[in-house]
């Protein structure tokens, strides 16, 4: 356990031309406040990922009113440190995000207006217990000077605040679960590190890497209630204590999410969806109000509707979650039609359309025939975005420009003879057959099978295919 401390020394216009004279807009006086967000690790965290190590909001600074003709000063700052307590080990590597906010105090509809002036992000290695680290950062036209440190609290020591130690004045006998440190130190050290994933509530260890279960619990990580681990229908590693098969451990076993959060497995880890009023990696942060700045990504914080949630975050488009901490996977709604590829650019969605389609959502089927009609009386058929012509008889090819022999396909049945004609083809049927393709036999008594010959045409007469 410990606390991360941030001291803002100055915030003002950076050097060089084009530096702003005042943080306030033309609408009148304003004041500054700061928000600090800590994330574990040095990786390029997504901007919207939660402040898993914690966050804090400063008090409001003194009111600043721009003085005409006066040089742009360093701006009046809030008093005191920004402190972010951490409950677990200090990770050593972390991302530090400092946001400078402006609160306009002019005649705003609905009260003061907030806007983000500057945001700096630093990825740092820092041992707990070390001296103050100083830094200067530029954010646009602004310059921020600050110092920070991590220090251990509650008898914790070490660069990660993981060793629990007594002051030298205290009795040298260590409490339950703690063992003496090296003989020269009248301190205590943390108990052995159990097997990774061993349940904090239901497991314990006496040797590093082991996981022994309390009564009523079983499984390699002590996450399975003993009553459920009967040997029926279970698959997984065998438990040495019971001889039964118990399920293999999953990231959500034992539900790591506190305060009614629901756990969902992610590759190699888990994610908690927190109920309103709670946030943090395991929904462990509660008692939060809008004053703590719990809404991320520009979410608007308003009062809660239930006694167990003191605030509600109204998220801007593209974000969701009880703290607006999750980016909406807008592509999961499959907004791109006709097989278009969806790209979420953050500020907007874009669809990359397949050939033959266009429009913001690929909703328009391009008519390739437009402006290049089919020749010789052919008609355009739209389909799949490709240009296709349905040609008049006697013509073929992509644009109906090629002459076609209508008799080439031998369309006349039963030995009928085919004649090309200006409007198509004509079949001269062999005796005993009739129809436009000589497809119908004629009965011996001269009455044809259905369909009847049209009036004026005798069986055997050539019939034109219209």
């Amino acid at each position: 356990a410990g606390v991360f401390e941030l001291q803002i020394h100055s915030f003002g216009p950076g050097p060089g031309p084009g530096a702003p004279r005042s943080p306030c807009s033309a609408r009148g006086p304003c004041r500054l406040f700061f928000r600090v967000c800590l994330k574990p690790g040095l990786s390029e965290e997504a901007a919207e990922s939660p402040c898993a190590l914690g966050a804090a909001l400063s008090a409001r600074g003194p009111v600043y009113t721009e003085q005409p003709e006066a040089p742009a000063p360093d701006l009046p700052l809030p008093n005191g440190l920004l402190q972010v307590p951490f409950r677990d080990a200090w990770p050593g590597t972390f991302s530090l995000i400092i946001e400078t906010w402006r609160e306009e105090l002019g005649d705003q509809i609905g009260g003061p207006a907030w806007s983000l002036l500057a945001r700096v992000t630093r990825r740092r290695r820092l041992a707990a217990g070390g001296p103050w680290a100083r830094d200067i950062q530029r954010a646009g036209a602004w310059e921020l000077r600050f110092s920070y440190r991590a220090r251990c609290e509650l008898l914790a020591v070490g660069t990660a605040c993981t060793r629990l130690c007594r002051p030298r004045s205290a009795p040298s006998r260590c409490g339950p679960g703690l063992r003496p440190c090296a003989p020269l130190e009248d301190e205590c050290e943390a108990p052995p590190v159990c097997r990774a994933g061993c349940s904090l509530e239901h497991g314990f260890c006496e040797q590093p890497g082991e996981c022994r279960c309390l009564e009523g619990w079983t499984g390699p990580l002590c996450t399975v209630p003993a009553s459920t681990s009967s040997c029926l229908g279970l698959r997984g590693p065998s438990s040495a204590t019971t001889g039964c098969l118990v399920p293999g451990p999953g990231p959500c076993d034992g539900n790591p999410c506190a305060n009614g959060g629901s756990c969902s497995e992610t590759p190699g880890s888990f994610e908690c969806t927190c109920p309103r009023g709670f946030y943090g990696l395991r929904c462990e942060v509660s008692g939060v109000t809008c004053a703590d700045g719990p809404c991320f990504n520009g979410g608007l914080c308003v009062g809660g509707a239930d006694p167990d949630s003191a605030y509600i975050c109204h998220c801007p488009p593209g974000f969701q979650g009880s703290n607006c901490e999750k980016r909406v996977d807008r592509c999961s709604l499959q907004p791109c039609r006709n097989g278009g590829l969806c790209l979420d650019l953050g500020h907007a969605l874009r669809c990359r359309c397949r050939a033959g389609f266009a429009g913001p959502r690929c909703e328009h089927n391009l008519d390739d025939c437009a402006g290049r009609a089919c020749a010789n009386g052919g008609t355009c058929v739209e389909g799949g975005g490709a240009h296709r012509c349905s040609c008049a008889l006697g013509f073929g090819g992509r644009d109906c420009r090629e002459r076609a022999d209508p008799c080439a396909a031998r369309p006349c049945a039963h030995g009928g003879r085919c004649y090309a004609h200006f409007s198509g083809l004509v079949c001269a049927c062999a005796p005993g057959y009739m129809g436009s393709r000589c497809e119908f036999p004629v009965h011996p008594d001269g009455v044809s099978a259905l369909p009847a010959a049209p009036p004026g045409l005798r069986p055997g007469d050539p019939q034109r295919y219209l």
């Epitope: 609905g110 009260g111 003061p112 907030w114 809008c290 004053a291 914080c301 308003v302 009062g303 509707a305």
Partner: antibody
């Protein structure tokens, strides 16, 4: 005792604007959202929006965004809703309320828009 | 917006009868649902919040249940003073939306 006292009935002409007030008492004004709800004659309730006096945060129902403007005056523990470009369809009873778990409501302000 | 479909639109019931009103949301609202009673010419009164929690001072004959998209308000034994209009409200997502209302009358 938590109470909301709303302004009286209004009869206005089409195209005009009106400002309805809601005076809160009996609790810490900045701790809770104030919601505004409309009820047209013989119809259901419609949520117009909310304002959070603590930080001035406002959430509108898009349907009313160009119709209503919500404000608060923390010093007088009062909330206000201005309705503009009024037409006969805006004739209704307008309630201010604390729509949280206790659910305290004002008595309603009747607005009649008629020429 | 989340659409709240309330049914029935009106009920005629005998005194002492068990009455149930239902509300169906167009999507999961995670039990963020309140029930209100409104008597003619009066402001609405909150009966239930978070789907099943009774507001202080509301008679225990009122109860709420449901989860996901389907919710109901039950009056275990109808009394004369229960006459009025009943509305559900979802507050899972902005904008908050009310059901169309149910008019409850005595047979």
């Amino acid at each position: 005792e938590v109470q909301f006292q709303q302004s009286g009935p209004e009869l206005v002409k089409p195209g005009a604007s009106v400002k309805i007030s809601c005076k809160a008492s009996g609790y810490t004004f900045t701790d809770y959202n104030i919601h505004w709800v409309r009820q047209s004659q013989g119809k259901s309730l419609e949520w117009i929006g909310l304002i959070y006096p603590f930080n001035g945060g406002i959430v509108y129902n898009q349907k009313f965004k160009s119709k209503a403007t919500l404000t608060v005056d923390n010093s007088s523990t009062s909330a206000y809703m201005e309705l503009r470009s009024l037409s006969s369809e805006d004739s209704a009873v307008y309630f201010c309320a604390r729509l949280n778990w206790e659910g305290y409501w004002g008595q309603g302000s009747t607005l009649i828009v008629s020429s | 917006d989340i659409k709240m479909t309330q049914s029935p639109s009106s009920i005629y019931a005998f005194l002492g009868e068990r009455v149930t009103i239902t509300c169906k949301a167009s999507q999961d609202i995670n039990s963020y649902l309140s029930w209100f009673q409104q008597k003619p010419g009066k402001s609405p009164k909150t009966l239930i919040y978070r789907a099943n929690r009774l507001v202080g001072g509301v008679p225990s004959r009122f109860s709420g249940s449901g989860s996901g998209q389907d919710y109901s308000l039950t009056i275990s034994s109808l009394e004369y003073e229960d006459v009025g209009d009943y509305y559900c409200l979802q507050y899972a997502e902005f904008p908050y939306t009310f059901g169309g209302g149910t008019k409850l009358e005595i047979k």
